[in-house]
């Protein structure tokens, strides 16, 4: 079901997203609850994802996400990543919320989630260069697979934004 043209104020702040797509959740109590993502965002588990078609630097991509009350994608599970991959175009690369600001290979997620080397999805030869301090998801043809690659943060790429579902 769709819950459109939501124009109300939430805690005295204008919602950035005026059109939401919501699904009804069965609640233990009698009241109805809605779980929503902004229109044109993808829904998976408890999050909403926006896949950009415009290219920008890593920093500008993160700002664009913030303007939508979201942040660059933080990958927490293989399932989440696989869902994202299904919605990406193989010929493009997409910034995610992982960076190495000092070039010391100390990777940081934008939401402060601890970086865990044992649950990473680097392409086999990556990360390749400490001067490349931002991470993209890209598709490699040999072997054919999606994975992570470190790239120059200033080079424009597409991106994936993530936000928690909105509950009404």
């Amino acid at each position: 079901q769709k819950y459109s043209q939501l124009l109300e104020k939430k805690t005295t702040k204008e919602l950035v997203h005026t059109t939401l797509e919501c699904v009804k959740k069965n609640m233990p109590v009698e009241e109805t609850a809605w779980s929503c993502c902004p229109k044109n965002w993808k829904s998976f588990s408890s999050n909403c994802y926006f896949i950009s078609t415009e290219s920008a630097s890593w920093q500008d991509s993160e700002k664009d996400c913030a303007r939508m009350e979201a942040h660059l994608l933080v990958i927490n599970t293989q399932e989440e990543q696989d869902f994202i991959f299904q919605n990406l175009q193989e010929e493009s690369a997409y910034f995610v919320g992982l960076s190495d600001p000092e070039g010391q290979r100390h990777w940081q997620w934008v939401d402060q989630t601890p970086y865990n080397e044992s649950s990473t999805f680097w392409h086999p030869r990556e990360p390749s260069d400490p001067n490349e301090r931002c991470v993209v998801l890209n598709f490699r043809k040999s072997p054919k697979r999606w994975g992570w690659n470190d790239v120059n943060c200033l080079g424009p790429q597409r991106s994936v934004c993530e936000m928690m579902k909105i509950h009404l």
Epitope: Q104, P124, P127, S128, P130
Partner: antibody, heavy 117, light 107 residues
Framework: QVQLQQSGAELMKPGASVKISCKAT????????IEWVKQRPGHGLEWIGE????????NDNEKFKGKATFTADTSSKKAYMQLSSLTSEDSAVYYC??????????WGQGTLVTVSA | ETTVTQSPASLSMAIGEKVTIRCVTS??????VNWYQQKPGEPPKLLIS???TLRPGVPSRFSSSGYGTDFVFTIENMLSEDVADYYC?????????FGGGTKLEIK
């Protein structure tokens, strides 16, 4: 400037193991992959494997699986390659190199390993 | 595994001549090929890195070209100091693989 200093030549008995070291200076050791390459006369150059010291991640050439093991100690800025169950086929010069991008940009001077009864 | 076929295995050229060495890979590796020079008793020296990029300090008489599976390394106006073994390395796929080498001598 970037330098890689390898341990000295080794004369080993068949069946023994040897551990070669590669001391890195002039850069942030933990941030760059260290490569290991084998060279035998008439056999050219062969890539054995690599390690990213900061994370301990390794990639190896299937051909050397079970033969070569890679480790690194970030405190001493040393990378190590251990070769086990040595045979005459393992007699070679072994190089460590530092990868930059996808190029082996800086090389150690080489360590000669001779396996002889 | 990506195999690399390097030719010729040896080459005898006169000073001032143009030297051409070719490497062909068994799979498409974009432009992830590196070219090395090795002199006796020394480690290989990187001359050209991926993307046909001449390394800093390497004379401009050295160059390379190619993309996909076919790669060419060129020395314009060979000098006596260029006598050495030359190797290509494909770094596009794991495992990294070297060409068999080319021994360059003076005619």
């Amino acid at each position: 400037q970037v330098q890689l200093q390898q341990s000295g030549a080794e004369l080993m008995k068949p069946g023994a193991s040897v551990k070669i070291s590669c001391k890195a200076t002039g850069y942030t050791f933990s941030s760059y992959w260290i490569e290991w390459v084998k060279q035998r006369p008439g056999h050219g150059l062969e890539w054995i494997g690599e390690i990213l010291p900061g994370s301990g991640r390794t990639n190896d050439n299937e051909k050397f699986k079970g033969k070569a093991t890679f480790t690194a100690d970030t405190s001493s800025k040393k990378a190590y390659m251990q070769l086990s169950s040595l045979t005459s086929e393992d007699s070679a010069v072994y190089y460590c190199a530092r990868r930059g991008g996808y190029s082996f940009a800086y090389w150690g001077q080489g360590t000669l390993v001779t396996v002889s009864a | 595994e990506t195999t690399v076929t390097q030719s010729p295995a040896s080459l005898s050229m006169a000073i001032g001549e143009k030297v051409t060495i070719r490497c062909v890979t068994s799979t498409d590796i974009d432009d992830d090929v590196n070219w090395y020079q090795q002199k006796p008793g020394e480690p290989p020296k990187l001359l050209i890195s991926e993307g046909n990029t001449l390394r800093p300090g390497v004379p401009s008489r050295f160059s390379s070209s190619g993309y996909g599976t076919d790669f060419v390394f060129t020395i314009e106006n060979m000098l006596s100091e260029d006598v050495a073994d030359y190797y290509c390395l494909q770094s596009g796929n794991l495992p990294y693989t070297f060409g068999g080498g080319t021994k360059l001598e003076i005619k």
